[in-house]
């Protein structure tokens, strides 16, 4: 069963290589456990960046070595991706799955184009 997922079209990473965006889903039922996955599409390749499953009222926890962090509020997930470099510029797609209670629903956003500009190295000062 399909579900609508909204996310911003474009986000610019800051000078420290951190980008944040909101992923919002239109829950057709009373979701109490949700799985959020961030996918990166570059060329025709799609790779998983990070994923987290959370219960409503519980914090959103990614794996310890994940480059993602996030918080949830109602039907919104605030996602932050860290450690980005210019080569990581690409389309980042938010996938949301309503895992429990049944029935299962899944929705995929149109993607957020994240632009990352590597900072210029500071010139040596004598």
């Amino acid at each position: 069963k399909a579900m609508h997922v909204a996310q911003p079209a474009v986000v610019l990473a800051n000078s420290r290589g951190t980008a944040s965006f909101v992923c919002e889903y239109a829950s057709p039922g009373k979701a109490t456990e949700v799985r959020v996955t961030v996918l990166r599409q570059a060329d025709s390749q799609v790779t998983e960046v990070c994923a987290a499953t959370y219960m409503m009222g519980n914090e959103l926890t990614f794996l310890d070595d994940s480059i993602c962090t996030g918080t949830s509020s109602g039907n919104q997930v605030n996602l932050t991706i860290q450690g980005l470099r210019a080569m990581d510029t690409g389309l980042y797609i938010c996938k949301v799955e309503l895992m429990y209670p049944p029935p299962y629903y899944m929705g995929i956003g149109n993607g957020t184009q994240i632009y990352v500009i590597d900072p210029e190295p500071c010139p040596d000062s004598d």
């Epitope: 009222g57 519980n58 049944p102 029935p103 299962y104 899944m106």
Partner: antibody
């Protein structure tokens, strides 16, 4: 090890209420939903509902709406089910069970059951 | 509600022999995500139910590999390759494709 320990057997009169408890140990209480299941004498299993220990949110079988109220006390890792306006057909063993996401939300640990007898 | 129907009601088996229990659902439990939301539980005499199988064919931790389960979207079979005395009890199939979660009526396996 994971354990769900339920309160003892109860004998109640018709029209009364009863509150059954389910104390969890051996895991992080707020990481798993708790379900409640009814088993009438010599009968099969009937799902009553579930509760999210984080925020007390519930899902329930319409058949038990107005009959069963599910609550939790996070501070003591305990789930409760209160049955109101008891009738003879509420006589049953009531189980609490933990849901496990790795098993696609199957009930992987069950309490020992609480027998509620309704008799005048 | 999804109705789960089991057969037979009672199954006498000789130890060492195979056994087979059927379960039928009133609606397909195969979701478009590829998951079949079918479970098997065993309730041994005087005990609480225990999980045997999840997602139609996966054995829960600690369940002996003499148990197996297969099926289509609506018809499922639990098989025990060689029945042992400790396998006696009532076997229940269940679904969680939709709320309310529902169980079959149970099949009582007994030793001949």
């Amino acid at each position: 090890q994971v354990q769900l320990v339920q309160s003892g057997a109860e004998v109640k009169k018709p029209g009364a209420s009863v509150k059954v408890s389910c104390k969890a140990s051996g895991y992080k209480f707020t990481d798993h939903f708790i379900n409640w299941v009814k088993q009438a004498p010599g009968q099969g299993l009937e799902w009553i509902g579930d509760i999210n220990p984080n925020n007390g949110g519930t899902n329930s079988n319409q058949k038990f709406e107005g009959k069963a109220t599910l609550t939790v006390d996070k501070s003591i890792s305990t789930a409760y089910m209160e049955l109101r306006r008891l009738r003879s057909d509420d006589t049953a063993v009531y189980y609490c069970a933990r849901l496990r996401r790795e098993y696609f939300y199957a009930m992987d640990y069950w309490g020992q059951g609480t027998l509620v007898t309704v008799s005048s | 509600d999804i109705v789960m129907t089991q057969s037979p009601l009672s199954l006498p088996v000789t130890p060492g022999e195979p056994a087979s229990i059927s379960c039928r659902s009133s609606k397909s439990l195969l979701h478009s995500n590829g998951i079949t939301y079918l479970y098997w539980y065993l309730q041994k005499p005087g005990q609480s139910p225990q999980l045997l199988i999840y997602q139609m064919s996966n054995l829960a931790s600690g369940v002996p590999d003499r148990f197996s389960s297969s099926g289509s979207g609506t018809d499922f079979t639990l098989k025990i390759s060689r029945v042992e005395a400790e396998d006696v009890g009532v076997y229940y199939c269940a679904q969680n494709l939709e709320l309310p979660l529902t169980f079959g009526g149970g099949t009582k396996l007994e030793i001949k």
